[in-house]
Interface confidence: low
Amino acid sequence: IAPSRPWALMEQYEVVLPWRLPGPRVRRALPSHLGLHPERVSYVLGATGHNFTLHLRKNRDLLGSGYTETYTAANGSEVTEQPRGQDHCFYQGHVEGYPDSAASLSTCAGLRGFFQVGSDLHLIEPLDEGGEGGRHAVYQAEHLLQTAGTCGVSDDSLGSLLGPRTAAVFRPRPGDSLPSRETRYVELYVVVDNAEFQMLGSEAAVRHRVLEVVNHVDKLYQKLNFRVVLVGLEIWNSQDRFHVSPDPSVTLENLLTWQARQRTRRHLHDNVQLITGVDFTGTTVGFARVSAMCSHSSGAVNQDHSKNPVGVACTMAHEMGHNLGMDHDENVQGCRCQERFEAGRCIMAGSIGSSFPRMFSDCSQAYLESFLERPQSVCLANAPDLSHLVGGPVCGNLFVERGEQCDCGPPEDCRNRCCNSTTCQLAEGAQCAHGTCCQECKVKPAGELCRPKKDMCDLEEFCDGRHPECPEDAFQENGTPCSGGYCYNGACPTLAQQCQAFWGPGGQAAEESCFSYDILPGCKASRYRADMCGVLQCKGGQQPLGRAICIVDVCHALTTEDGTAYEPVPEGTRCGPEKVCWKGRCQDLHVYRSSNCSAQCHNHGVCNHKQECHCHAGWAPPHCAKLLTEVHAASGSLP
């Protein structure tokens, strides 16, 4: 147990002074039960050269109607109470002008949490006691000084429990109200052990951190049309109720045994999650029972491994994913993670790496849908009462961890002759054991195709002759013509495509005249604009579920419930010949290109979406001037 270990520290951060936008004037006194924290609040943050406007709404679904807290009183007796006055300061929302953005923050003492813009995940926390207007640090997860964390669930524990299907996903937006038959609810009970309590110092600090964590987990699961509702919190402020071992599998077993004994007198819940301050052995930060949701074994253990609560929230989301039948992404052939950020990992990746993930992969969604087909999953269909809502590296676990060159599972299951399953070192004479550029224990020669071109905005990737993994996915240079538009970060955004995405196959872009005005709040009036980069205007198709619309003649715009914000035309959409929407205006394609990048690629490559040379098969980056074989020979590193 290491209750006094220092939190991870930030390596790089930017100091910002958040500015709260004035809310609507209230002319009458608010009833005291509404609390100090408004239903909605907006902040402007100047960070990374941008002014981000965060629109937040209190997460009213955070606490279940019968939410209880259990702790040990001064006299040693166990107390369970239903706290009165369920006001809280935990918010969710989006960033203005960024269609796929998300935010999850607490405003209790300054701003703390995350906001996501495109593929950038920004973390924010106060630097001093100055409250919401004081100095705050904004940084990215990779700038937290922390070690990578892995999940202890291995392939052999998954067994035949997994039978993937397809999943329904939605992009949550303010004002979404989804049909209850679609939404699933996880009623969550969180247990906090004594080591975590000692680390945080008080019941209030524990409560605050747990609510932050669950708020983040809920935000991550909303993309799968799930809500995670906290129905109970148990704080072991005096002593642990069972032995919390550094071995996560032992701790999980103890948790589930304890839970089975407590179930009759504890809150009825769908899932229990332990948050511990104990340092699990090795790189493991979480462990879960697979496909156990809604059963007596529905639970997981999570080490609070990072200064920022987003860290343990990602671990909890991952372990809960196992409870919901999900496997690790690496174990599923052809699994696609749509993440485009540097580390490129989704929530069910076996290890966290240096960046916190923020989405589920295609195969996680398929596993989830498969789990939801089971009669067992019925406990997730009942909505809480919404009216009152206020280990050292282990050889044989299939994860290549510190000190291992490969890991093909336990010796009895290993079918990989390139890997010595007892030592997790490469077999004699083997250069590699895993990876798309590894074939029969040898690294494939430079120039072999390892990732074909998916569409006209993609680029194919080739093995480099040195590494068993395929190079990072890259895309055509932004601005390359594609069907009806211009490539932008691997997509081909057009008005027609956007309208189809929202309104279904029958959706089309509205008449050009519809784009010649911006709608003002409330769908009441409009003002002229000279380009097609304002509000997304469509016609035809089916009105998207849970979205309000503003109709003017044949022009249909999607808006929030209260009519204050409209779905914008996304960045990169074609708005005319050789023109694209960029920063809300129709601009010349040259905005994508700082220089004639392709000229630097020596006719042996093309420029990619990052303005870097993407070399033809067999040629070496960065400028495709030399053959890979020459470069390898010169460096003496040819395998």
Partner: nanobody, 118 residues
């Protein structure tokens, strides 16, 4: 609105094969996922197999015997069934899922009868 029409059902002996088809009235490029389900008399409808643009998945009871595939040009998905057993007897339904920002729309076909008997 997407209409789905199943065909290819019939009577077959144990150990035999059948190929079911499900034709969609619209391009299946826009359908996120398509799948086969079956319902035997007196039983609940159960999932058999699914396919998306990037993955296929099967129920344990049919794994290794059934193959799901799709032909985007024909707007059709198929279920190739081998080594059929009497317990595979059921009405087989095709389902399509179209994702919309608020969730999904599910579309079902009318079903085709498969009977495995000697």
């Amino acid at each position: 609105e997407v209409q789905l029409v199943e065909s290819g059902g019939g009577l077959v002996q144990p150990g035999g094969s059948l190929r079911l088809a499900c034709a969609a009235s619209k391009s299946i490029d826009n359908i996120h996922a398509m799948g086969w389900y079956r319902q035997a008399p007196g039983n609940e409808r159960e999932w058999v197999a699914s396919i998306t643009s990037s993955a296929t998945a099967y129920a344990d009871s049919v794994k290794g015997r059934f193959i799901i595939s799709r032909d985007n040009a024909e707007n059709t998905i198929y279920l190739q069934m081998h080594s059929l057993k009497p317990e595979d007897t059921a009405v087989y339904y095709c389902k399509g899922q179209v994702l919309v920002p608020g969730g999904r729309n599910d579309y079902w076909g009318q079903g085709t009868q498969v009977t495995v008997s000697s």
